[in-house]
């Protein structure tokens, strides 16, 4: 999100007052304020539903609650992607979809949510205790994943209240660092504001050279910077082995949907019109986890150019390879 603030032109500070520090003191709060406002912890919600008509058929819905630009979605089963899970689908917001059995139909529902229907028969079909995970790669938040499965006593047709997501992972270590900086910045901003109350404010007046005051553009993760690392897609994995995750499931009453937001209970938003987004510049881009390093030229471990963690529609399950095996 880019924030624009209209700020009147500033007169040079009077000698003996703020000096050179005056400019910095006035600009810094705007920058920090913008960062504080735009900063927010993203959430991923997962809903798993067993179809009433086909008891061995599942519908998985996942969504991303964040302000960033989704670059890729990966759906898997049997655990988190890269931790023993098997990729079911990979969805890219511009390039399309790659899906793997038993996925029957993966699709984007809105700009920030996807759904996946799984086949109800066959050796690879899911079972009631299957754990499904959805991983969203986005900029600037990084990679976020949540998992869910049907409660042990789930009756088709009923819906379970949202429960905390069992897994919330930011694969990019930098995320924590950024959060720390933002937190520090917000605290520092408050400190500056408090100090500012006790000192005379500098005189502000409109610019004499133009009828309109100049625009001071506060910095925030910009669309330009997002575009540089834009690698959209989604993947869904699932497996019918016993769930190894310590998932939280509601035990009250029968439930048909297991809804697992990453934090507080968030209901999925209704369908939203897709915003028209530019196609990322051509170049090598990596899988979901590596999507943000698309231009780095380094290949994620165990990945191949065409297998990609689903930057390539071809190898959703080849999430362990670069992008070739899409």
């Amino acid at each position: 999100m880019r924030t624009e603030a209209q700020v009147p032109a500033l007169q040079p500070p009077e000698p003996g007052l703020e000096g050179a520090m005056g400019h910095r003191t006035l600009v810094l709060p705007w920058v920090l304020l913008t960062l504080c406002v735009t900063a927010g912890t993203p959430e991923v919600w997962v809903q798993v539903r067993m179809e009433a008509t086909e008891l061995s058929s599942f519908t998985i819905r996942c969504g991303f609650l964040g302000s960033g630009s989704i670059s890729l979605v990966t759906v898997s089963w049997g655990g988190p992607n890269g931790a023993g899970g098997t990729t079911l689908a990979v969805l890219h917001p511009e390039r399309g979809i790659r899906q793997w059995a038993p996925a029957r139909q993966a699709r984007w529902e809105t700009q920030s949510s996807i759904s996946l229907i799984l086949e109800g028969s066959g050796a690879s079909s899911p079972c009631a205790n299957t754990t499904f995970c959805c991983k969203f790669a986005s900029f600037p938040e990084g990679s976020w994943e949540a998992c869910g499965s049907l409660p042990p006593s789930s009756d088709p047709g009923l819906s379970a209240p949202p429960t905390p997501a069992p897994i919330l992972r930011a694969d990019l270590a930098g995320i924590l660092g950024v959060s720390g900086v933002l937190l520090f910045g917000c605290v520092y901003l408050l400190h500056l504001l408090r100090r500012h109350k006790h000192r005379p404010a500098p005189r502000l007046q409109p610019s004499r050279t133009s009828p309109q005051a100049p625009r001071a553009r506060a910095w925030a993760p910009s669309q330009a910077s997002q575009a540089a690392l834009h690698v959209p897609y989604a993947t869904i994995n699932t497996s019918c082995r016993p769930a190894t995750l310590d998932t939280a499931h509601p035990h009250g009453g029968p439930s048909w949907w297991a809804s697992l937001p990453t934090h507080a209970a968030h209901r999925p938003q209704g369908p939203a019109a897709w915003a028209s987004t530019p196609i990322p510049a051509r170049g090598s881009f990596v899988s979901v986890e590596n999507g943000l390093y698309a231009q780095a030229g380094e290949r994620p471990p165990h990945t191949g150019p065409g297998l990609t963690l689903f930057p390539d529609p071809r190898g959703p399950r080849a999430m362990e390879g670069p992008l070739g095996v899409r």
Epitope: T86, T87, H92, P93, E94, R95, G96, I97, R98, Q99, W100, A101, Q105, A106, R107, W274, I279, R282, S284, F285, G304, P305, G306, L307, T308, P311, D312, P313, R314, G315, P316, R317, A318, E320, G321, P322, L323, G324, V325, R326
Partner: antibody, heavy 118, light 107 residues
């Protein structure tokens, strides 16, 4: 040079099965998905499905789910497609195609003509 | 299934001319459309991917454009070797679907 060399033409009887091959060379076989496409009577193309040589994962369109079986042999860098319960509708040219990391078929096989006739 | 319609089945052109082949999707497919060229008795070959990116080695007289539902492959300064059938493909949703093809003949 990247190449996908397919097996020769097949003349088979209705109700039987046929297994066609696609041998990859010039690149690391397990790095790219292999897809299969059908072209009937020189007309348009139909997407059949894909296999991930690295994991063996497969994907079929509903239409071909009960018709085709996709497999790979990593040791020989070869992908296979078996077609069963053949009818005259299955007479066509079948292509394997490599799915690139840029999300398109960047290399196509030489094609295998399958003719189903009694 | 998403239907990809190539309304012109045959287009006749002369060497040096410009020809535009269109492909219409039955629903929004974003930029997930490719163009392939198939010469007589040959396998298809990639021309354009993701609506407008040119495949390696493809002459710059081939240009792709469009997004959403309407896509165009334009050949400027047509050459005799461009005699072929051109197919569009969408991979936005399963099953992937091809257009019916447009055959370009040289007068």
């Amino acid at each position: 040079e990247v190449q996908l060399q397919q097996s020769g033409p097949e003349l088979v009887k209705p109700g039987s099965s046929v297994k066609i091959s696609c041998k990859a060379s010039g690149y690391t076989f397990t790095d790219y998905n292999m897809d299969w496409v059908k072209q009937s009577h020189g007309q348009s193309l139909e997407y059949i499905g894909a296999v991930n040589p690295n994991t063996g994962d497969i994907s079929y369109t509903q239409k071909f789910k009960d018709k085709a079986t996709l497999t790979v042999d990593k040791s020989s860098s070869t992908a296979y497609m078996e077609l069963r319960s053949l009818t005259s509708e299955d007479s066509a040219v079948y292509y394997c195609a490599r799915w690139s990391e840029s999300w398109y078929f960047d290399v196509w096989g030489t094609g295998t003509t399958v003719t189903v006739s009694s | 299934d998403i239907v990809m319609t190539q309304s012109q089945k045959l287009m006749s052109t002369s060497v040096g001319d410009r020809v535009s082949i269109t492909c219409k999707a039955s629903q929004n497919v974003r930029a997930a459309v490719d163009w392939y060229q198939q010469k007589p008795r040959q396998s298809p070959k990639a021309l354009i991917f993701l609506a407008s990116s040119r495949h390696t080695g493809v002459p710059d007289r081939f240009t792709g454009s469009g997004s959403g539902t309407d896509f165009t492959l334009t050949i400027t300064n047509v050459q005799s070797e461009d005699l072929a059938t051109y197919f569009c493909l969408q991979h936005w949703n399963y099953p992937y679907t091809f257009g019916g093809g447009t055959r370009v003949e040289i007068k």
